[in-house]
Amino acid sequence: MAVTACQGLGFVVSLIGIAGIIAATCMDQWSTQDLYNNPVTAVFNYQGLWRSCVRESSGFTECRGYFTLLGLPAMLQAVRALMIVGIVLGAIGLLVSIFALKCIRIGSMEDSAKANMTLTSGIMFIVSGLCAIAGVSVFANMLVTNFWMSTANMYTGMGGMVQTVQTRYTFGAALFVGWVAGGLTLIGGVMMCIACRGLAPEETNYKAVSYHASGHSVAYKPGGFKASTGFGSNTKNKKIYDGGARTEDEVQSYPSKHDYV
C-alpha cells in the first residue's frame, strides 16, 4: 500500500513538475525590465527564451521572435538545450512510469520489470529536474552578471553628449516557475526511486508451499506484497512469491483447499 502510494504520488508530483518545466520554457517572462531606480519608461520590456516582448502603457503588447540561431548568446542556447532535454527526459519518464504504475495491469508484466521501469522513470525525472534547475540557474546567473554590468554602465560617464537608456533586466516569473517545477520533478523522481525499492524482489522467487502446523489450523500462504506492508505472515519482511505472474489483487486471500488439515 505504501509503495503504491509513494509511486503514485511520485508520478503525480513529477507530472506537475514537468508541466511546470514546459510552461516555464514557453513563458515570455524569463527576464523583466527592472523598474527600481531606473528612468520610468512608458514601455515595459520582458524577454523569454524564444522571443522578446514590449508592453506599452495602453496594454498593447508586441513580441518579436529571435529569428536567428547563430546570433544568439551561447548561454541562451545552452539554457534552451537544458530545458528541452529536461522536457524530453521528463516526457519519456512519464511514459515509462505510466506502465510501471502498480495500479495499472499490462498483460503478464513481472513485478521486477515494473520495479526496473519505476527506477528508470525515477532517474529520468531526477535528471529532468536537474536539467531544468540548471537551465534556470544559468539564465539567472547571466541576468545577475548583465544587471551589474549595466548598472556600472549607468553610472560611468558616457563618451558623447547623447545618452542611451540602459534597460536593466531582473528575474522574471518563468525563473521561479522553472525552479519550483524542477524541484517538484526532482522530488517526484526520488519518490519513484524509493517506490522501486519497495517493488523490487530482494531474493530469488520461490514457489509458495503450504506448511501444516501441528495442532493448529494455520497455513502459511503466499503473502505477495502484503508481506512488505504488514498484512502477510512474513515477519522478516522478505517478499514471498508464488512464482506466478499475478498482481497483488490476484493473490488469494480467501480459504483454499490447502488451508485446512
Epitope: 528612468p39 520610468v40 519608461t41 512608458a42 506599452e56 547623447v162 534597460t167
Partner: antibody, heavy 119, light 113 residues
C-alpha cells in the same frame, strides 16, 4: 464618435485651487490611459500628467509635481485634474487627451478649457 | 528629463514644395525590445487642439495623408511633407513618448510664402 469635453477652467488667484473635469464618450473609458496637456498663450505644448486605465500608474511633469493630482472615475467616464498652489505660469489652455492604443501616442484631444491664474 | 529640440522654429514655403523639419532628443528614444522609436508627431492648426500625425517615429495615423512621412531613429528624427498643401499650414510638434515625463519640442511653424 470619440468626444472629450473639458470644464472647470476659470480665473483663479495665485495660491488658489481649481478642479478641472473631462467628460468622455464614444469609447470604453476604463480601457484607456488618459493625459492632461497644457498650452500657455502663444507657447508650445507641455505635458502635465498621465493616469493609467486602472489608476495603478500615475506620472506628473516636474513643474506640477506635488501641486496637481490627477484622478478618474471609470463608472462615470470622467477624468479630473485637481490643482492647488496655483501660479501665474499655470495659466494655459488645458487639454484632456486619450492615450492611444499604439505607440503611447496621444490620439484624441478635447477642445480644451482655459485657466487664468492672476491677481 | 529628455529635451526635445526642433528645428527650424519656422519655415516659409510655397504650395507644392517639399518640406523637411527636424527633431532631436537628448536621449535615445529607441527601444531594443521591439526595435521601435517612441517619438510622435502632431499637427496643430490655429485655434484647434493638436492632431496626431505619426507614431513610432514613422507610422502614419489612420486618415493622415501619405504626403506626411516620418523617419529617423535613436535621437534624430525628421518629418517630411512631400508636397505642401495650403491646409498643412500649422505648428508641428514632436514628442518623446518613451520616458516620463513625456516632453514636447517647442514646435516648427509652417507658413506660406
Amino acid at each position: 464618435v470619440v468626444q472629450l469635453v473639458e470644464s472647470g477652467g476659470d480665473f483663479v488667484q495665485p495660491g488658489g485651487s481649481r478642479k478641472l473635469s473631462c467628460a468622455v464618450s464614444g469609447f470604453t473609458f476604463s480601457s484607456f490611459g488618459m493625459h492632461w496637456v497644457r498650452q500657455a498663450p502663444e507657447k508650445g505644448l507641455e505635458w502635465v500628467a498621465y493616469i493609467s486605465s486602472g489608476t495603478t500608474n500615475i506620472y506628473y511633469a516636474d513643474t506640477v509635481k506635488g501641486r496637481f493630482t490627477v484622478s478618474r472615475d471609470n463608472p462615470k467616464n470622467s477624468l479630473f485634474l485637481h490643482m492647488t498652489s496655483l501660479r501665474s505660469e499655470d495659466t494655459a489652455m488645458y487639454y484632456c487627451v486619450r492615450s492611444g492604443y499604439y505607440g503611447n501616442s496621444l490620439d484624441y484631444w478635447g477642445q480644451g478649457t482655459p485657466l487664468t491664474v492672476s491677481s | 528629463d529628455i529635451v526635445m529640440t526642433q528645428s527650424p522654429s519656422s519655415l516659409t514655403v510655397t504650395a507644392g514644395e517639399k518640406v523637411t523639419m527636424s527633431c532631436k532628443s537628448s536621449q535615445s528614444l529607441f527601444n531594443s525590445g521591439n526595435q521601435r522609436n517612441y517619438l510622435t508627431w502632431y499637427q496643430q492648426k490655429p485655434g484647434q487642439p493638436p492632431k496626431l500625425l505619426i507614431y513610432w517615429a514613422s507610422t502614419r495615423e489612420s486618415g493622415v495623408p501619405d504626403r506626411f512621412t516620418g523617419s529617423g531613429s535613436g535621437t534624430g528624427f525628421t518629418l517630411t511633407i512631400s508636397s505642401v498643401q495650403a491646409e498643412d499650414l500649422a505648428f508641428y510638434y514632436c514628442q518623446n513618448v518613451y520616458i516620463y515625463p513625456l516632453t514636447f519640442g517647442l514646435g516648427t511653424k509652417l507658413e506660406l510664402r
